[in-house]
């Protein structure tokens, strides 16, 4: 069964800046990755970035840089300032759409006791 993993890390240099990394463990052709916060994209979450392997990347504030790390993993850096900046207990979710298996998603957040720079 395919699985999705999510890591959330607060940057040591910018304490309100986050890096989210997500990966897909499974076969099939990854068609789209959707990163959201505040819950899954289909359950009230707000989309931060959409990554398509052929048609490119779309991102919305406070997302600063979304990119493919490998064919089956992505990373997203969030800006650390402004009214829409994330807080330490924000939930981030990644949804991988793989053809023809379907969609698989997982969520993660920064552990309450995490020091800056440690991965969740």
């Amino acid at each position: 069964t395919p699985e999705v993993w999510v890591q959330v890390r607060m940057e040591a240099t910018e304490l309100s800046s986050f890096t989210i990394r997500c990966g897909f463990l499974g076969s099939g052709s990854i068609s789209l990755v959707t990163v959201s916060w505040g819950g899954p994209n289909g359950a009230g979450g707000t989309t931060l970035a959409v990554l398509h392997p052929e048609r490119g990347i779309r991102q919305w504030a406070p997302a600063r840089q979304a990119r493919w790390e490998t064919q089956s993993s992505i990373s997203l850096i969030l800006e650390g300032s402004g009214a829409s900046s994330p807080c330490a207990n924000t939930t981030f979710c990644c949804k991988f759409a793989s053809f023809p298996e379907g969609s698989w998603e997982a969520c993660g957040s920064l552990p309450p006791s995490s020091d800056p720079g440690l991965s969740a």
Partner: antibody
Framework: EVQLVESGGGLVKPGGSLRLSCAAS????????MSWVRQAPGKGLELVSA????????YYPDTVKGRFTISRDDAENSLYLQMNSLRAEDTAVYYC?????????????WGQGTLVTVSS | DIVMTQSPDSLAVSLGERATINCKAS??????VAWYQQKPGQPPKLLIY???HRFTGVPDRFSGSGSGTDFTLTISSLQAEDVAVYFC?????????FGQGTKLEIK
């Protein structure tokens, strides 16, 4: 304008074979996942085969597995469905359809369909 | 397999009135739900994708809502050209599955 045109349907005896074709135009065929969906007379819709845009991943339900084979020729902008060991219950209109990644794999374009009748 | 169950099987609504079609999934399908309209002798046409997004050219009297396992297609003011069979569809998990269809007629 996106166009999908099916051909190859007809009357065939039980145990016989048919090859359906779908000619695509108006879009970059190689960038899309494609499917065959059938509809028996007066009945609902059933996905009978799907193929990923790279051609590496395919799907068949148990009802047709081992009998139907989906393939694509991106140079010819064509989708195919080879149907062997046909049964009376395979009688249906067969539609070629295109999946849109950005729409959660919804099928945003359909052909007019080709009728396959399996009868002795 | 995820089973999509539509209700009602058929529906008769007066012109200008609201029509509501429900679709229940046997398990959560996130937001990967679409609705199609099929008129006699024609292929299905995409109306709604991602639960509530109208496809290009679809009149705004059509709307979709819901989450998780329960979804609804609403036609706010029925027009004569809306007479058709409507299907819900989930593309969350293979195999993609459709509802059995709801036949919409004018009362």
């Amino acid at each position: 304008e996106v166009q999908l045109v099916e051909s190859g349907g007809g009357l065939v005896k039980p145990g016989g074979s048919l090859r359906l074709s779908c000619a695509a135009s108006g879009f970059t065929f190689s960038s899309y996942h494609m499917s065959w969906v059938r509809q028996a007379p007066g009945k609902g819709l059933e996905l009978v085969s799907a193929i990923s845009r790279d051609g590496d991943s395919t799907y068949y339900p148990d009802t047709v597995k081992g009998r139907f084979t989906i393939s694509r020729d991106d140079a010819e902008n064509s989708l195919y469905l080879q149907m062997n060991s046909l049964r009376a219950e395979d009688t249906a209109v067969y539609y070629c359809s295109r999946h849109e990644d950005y729409f959660g794999f919804a099928m945003d374009s359909w052909g007019q369909g080709t009728l396959v009748t399996v009868s002795s | 397999d995820i089973v999509m169950t539509q209700s009602p099987d058929s529906l008769a609504v007066s012109l200008g009135e609201r029509a509501t079609i429900n679709c229940k999934a046997s398990q959560s399908v996130s937001n990967d739900v679409a609705w199609y309209q099929q008129k006699p002798g024609q292929p299905p046409k995409l109306l709604i994708y991602y639960v509530s997004h109208r496809f290009t050219g679809v009149p705004d009297r059509f709307s979709g809502s819901g989450s998780g396992t329960d979804f609804t297609l609403t036609i706010s003011s029925l027009q004569a050209e809306d007479v058709a069979v409507y299907f819900c569809h989930q593309a969350y998990r293979s195999p993609w599955t459709f509802g059995q269809g709801t036949k919409l007629e004018i009362k």
